[in-house]
Interface confidence: low
């Protein structure tokens, strides 16, 4: 007689690992013989699929090699005519070993920025992702983290960070291994020690020491007046990251030394500087040489002093003018550190306004060198003490170089303001009235050694600071 | 990624000026650390440098071209122009405009393909 | 005006060092750029500030600048390094210099 479908041995859910046989089975009782059809996610199965096997009149579906994209609801339908179609439906989980997807890769990083070493798994059940560093298992805290995604974040990276890494992803069904990869870590050159100012007699040799660390181990050069140490000799040791080098000069005309400590970064270097003076007793001073250009200020040491946009004279007696001139300011700068609260804000805005000297906006720029009245203000006002400390040290030799600019203005050299207010520069920040002048305590007992004429206040208009000119 | 492309004509007559123009896309013309060169060279021979605009309009000139040479700009249409006037067989070269810029001590990092000038009557 | 002087040829056997010089008045104090330029194409930067390399250089360029003589130097020459090579410098005038040129050939 003629009997409806039934499924006697309902569909269920199947466990397979990759690239194993999953097999379903679909017993169904009935008369006559059933056509027995088979869907995955509702999407019929073809019976030439060759990834498939169908046997056994239809009741037997193998899947010969799991794919990790086999997941998923499949079905059986078995239909004879009599009575209606009957299914029955049951899962297919891929088990899968874990596997990592995204290996982590060396890394070369900057100390203090933050890495992040990559290990993407794939697995199931979900692969838990741990760390090795060298031989033992990595302990996360405040800065080392397991992302989510398996990925190490190490931030603001350390010197002790650097090493072997590799990541570990294990489930129930077994652990998969990176390879091992390195972390370098790089830190930008750092002088140690810089080399310090000289005042020598002529003739003398003098040794330039400097040290200075970074990873990659810095190369140093040296700089003499902005251009290539031409003679000298120069002596380097390297010991435990620590770069030494010594440059041992014969004496024959003053000059600024700069050590330059130099590390690579990819395709970025990082660089550290520091300059010291070699100054020759008894050196007779060249003429002031007025060769140079104009040029808003870039630095940083003269920032606060110099008015903004002030365009002032760089001279190329320097390779690089504006560097060459930073570094006289910053090493003057040094030398003040030792003086009075008073002096120091007027002898800055003194100094900054030498080296930077304001700029003539002529066809061929010339500096316009400070004004006499403001520079007797620095003189007998506010640095009285410190000034008779530099002119002692002036006298002897100290300050005497080449490179005039180093130098202390002689102020009665300088043009009076009262001459041509356009040919002498003011210092705005010592701009005060016969008001203000009593806020200032008295910097010695005597009396000043001139009389310092009013200088204008700042709200004068007869001598407002000199208009700023752009260069075409 | 800043492109230049020089465009003008391929002949000129002596005497007569010849004038070409460089349009830069990707970029401003008057953005501060950048320059804008013209440069040629004469068939089978080296590169010579003719003479900049700066980002503020400024311009210098090299100075054996000084008396026939002068750059404009058109910031609406972000180009450059350089016209040399009273041209000879001599100033038959390809003319290449480049960028200079600060970031690299104010080397030419991007130029033209080039165009082809010919002064003949 | 300010004279570079560069030699009209210079070969290297291949994967050997060749050394492109370039002479002028106290070059040391300026900064020297290099660009290399293959036939029917523009030139294209190689070097800048003297031994600075951008991005897509490779890095057998490498360059020293100092006294009288800036040189560039290419370790382990390659085939496709065969080309002209032009040294550049700016002047305190602002003017740009440019040398005369050097063939290099890879043999």
């Known amino acids: 007689l003629p009997k409806a479908p039934v499924i006697t041995t309902p569909l269920e859910t199947v466990d397979a690992l990759v690239e194993e046989v999953a097999t379903f089975m679909c017993a169904v009782e009935s008369y006559p013989q059933p056509e027995i059809s088979w869907t995955r996610n509702k999407i019929l199965i073809k019976l030439f699929d060759t990834r498939y096997s169908i046997r056994e009149n239809g009741q037997l579906l193998t899947i010969l090699s799991v794919e990790d994209s086999d997941d998923g609801i499949y079905c059986c339908t078995a239909n004879n005519g009599v009575g209606g179609a009957v299914e029955s439906c049951g899962a297919l989980q891929v088990k899968m070993k874990p596997k990592i997807t995204r290996p982590p890769i060396n890394v070369k990083i900057i100390e203090g920025l933050k890495a992040v070493l990559p290990c993407t798994t794939m697995g199931n059940p979900k692969p838990s992702v741990s760390w090795i560093k060298g031989d033992s298992p990595l302990r996360e805290n405040s800065r080392i983290a397991v992302l989510e995604s398996g990925s190490l974040r190490i931030h603001n990276v350390q010197k002790e960070d650097a090493g072997q890494y590799r990541c570990v992803a294990k489930n129930s069904l077994g652990t998969a291994y990176s390879k091992v990869v390195k972390l370098e870590v790089e830190v930008f050159a750092r002088i140690l020690r810089a080399p310090e100012s000289h005042n020598v007699t002529f003739g003398s040799f003098v040794t330039l020491h400097c040290t200075a660390t970074g990873i990659p181990v810095p190369t140093i050069t040296w700089i003499e007046n902005g251009n290539a140490v031409s003679s000298g000799s120069i002596q380097e040791s390297v010991k435990d990251r620590v770069i030494d080098s010594r440059l041992q000069l014969f004496i024959t005309k003053p000059g600024l030394y700069t050590c330059i400590a130099t590390n690579k970064h990819g395709e970025k270097f990082s660089t550290a500087k520091a300059a010291a003076t070699i100054s020759i007793a008894e050196w007779s001073k060249p003429q002031k040489d007025n060769k140079g250009y104009c040029a808003q200020y870039r630095g940083e040491v003269c920032n606060a002093v110099l008015a903004k946009d002030a365009l002032v004279f760089l001279n190329t007696s320097y390779a690089d003018p504006e560097e060459a001139q930073e570094l006289l300011v910053h090493t003057a700068w040094n030398e003040l550190k030792v003086v009075s609260p008073v002096c120091r804000p007027a002898a800055e805005a003194l100094l900054c306004n030498h080296i930077f000297q304001e700029c003539s906006p002529g066809v061929v720029p010339t500096p316009i060198p400070i004004c006499r009245e403001y520079c007797l203000a620095v003189k007998e006002l506010f640095c009285a003490k410190e000034w008779l400390v530099m002119e002692e040290k002036t006298h002897r030799g100290l300050y005497r170089s080449e490179m005039h600019l180093l130098s202390v203005p002689e102020c009665s050299k300088l043009p009076s303001m009262h001459w041509d207010p356009t040919a002498c520069a003011r210092l705005p920040h010592l701009d005060y009235n016969k008001e203000n002048l009593k806020t200032f305590p008295p910097m010695t007992s005597s009396k000043p050694s001139v009389d310092i004429p009013n200088l204008p206040s700042s709200s004068s208009s007869s001598f407002s600071v000199s208009p700023t000119y752009s260069m075409t | 990624q800043v492109q230049v492309q020089e465009s003008g004509p391929g002949l000129v007559k002596p005497s007569q000026t010849l004038s070409l123009t460089c349009t830069v896309s990707?970029?401003?013309?008057?953005?501060?650390?950048?320059?804008w060169s013209w440069i040629r060279q004469p068939p089978g021979k080296g590169l010579e440098w003719m003479g900049v605009?700066?980002?503020?309009?400024?311009?210098y000139y090299s100075p054996s071209l000084k008396s026939r040479t002068s750059i404009s700009r058109d910031t609406s249409k972000n180009q450059f122009s350089l016209h040399l006037s009273s041209v000879t067989p001599d100033d038959t070269a390809v003319y290449y405009c480049?960028?200079?810029?600060?970031?690299?001590?104010?080397?030419?990092?991007?130029w033209g393909q080039g165009t082809q000038v010919t002064v003949s009557s | 005006s300010y004279e570079l002087t560069q030699s009209p040829s210079v070969s290297v056997a291949l994967r050997q060092t060749a050394k492109i010089t370039c002479g002028g008045d106290?070059?040391?104090?300026?900064?020297a750029q290099w660009y290399q330029q293959k036939p029917g194409q523009a030139p294209v930067m190689v070097l800048y500030?003297?031994?600075r390399r951008p991005s897509g250089i490779p890095e057998r360029f490498s360059g020293s600048n100092s006294g009288n003589t800036a040189t560039l130097t290419i370790s382990g020459a390659q085939a496709e390094d065969e080309a002209d090579y032009y040294c550049?410098?700016?002047?305190?005038?602002?003017?740009?210099?440019f040398g005369g040129g050097t063939h290099l050939t890879v043999l």
């Open positions: 500030a003297d031994s």
């Open positions: 106290n070059i040391g104090s300026k900064n």
């Open positions: 990707g970029g401003s013309i008057t953005a501060r650390y950048y320059s």
């Open positions: 605009i700066a980002y503020d309009g400024s311009t």
């Open positions: 550049h410098v700016w002047d305190s005038s602002t003017n740009a210099w």
């Open positions: 480049a960028r200079g810029s600060s970031r690299v001590a104010a080397a030419f990092d991007s």
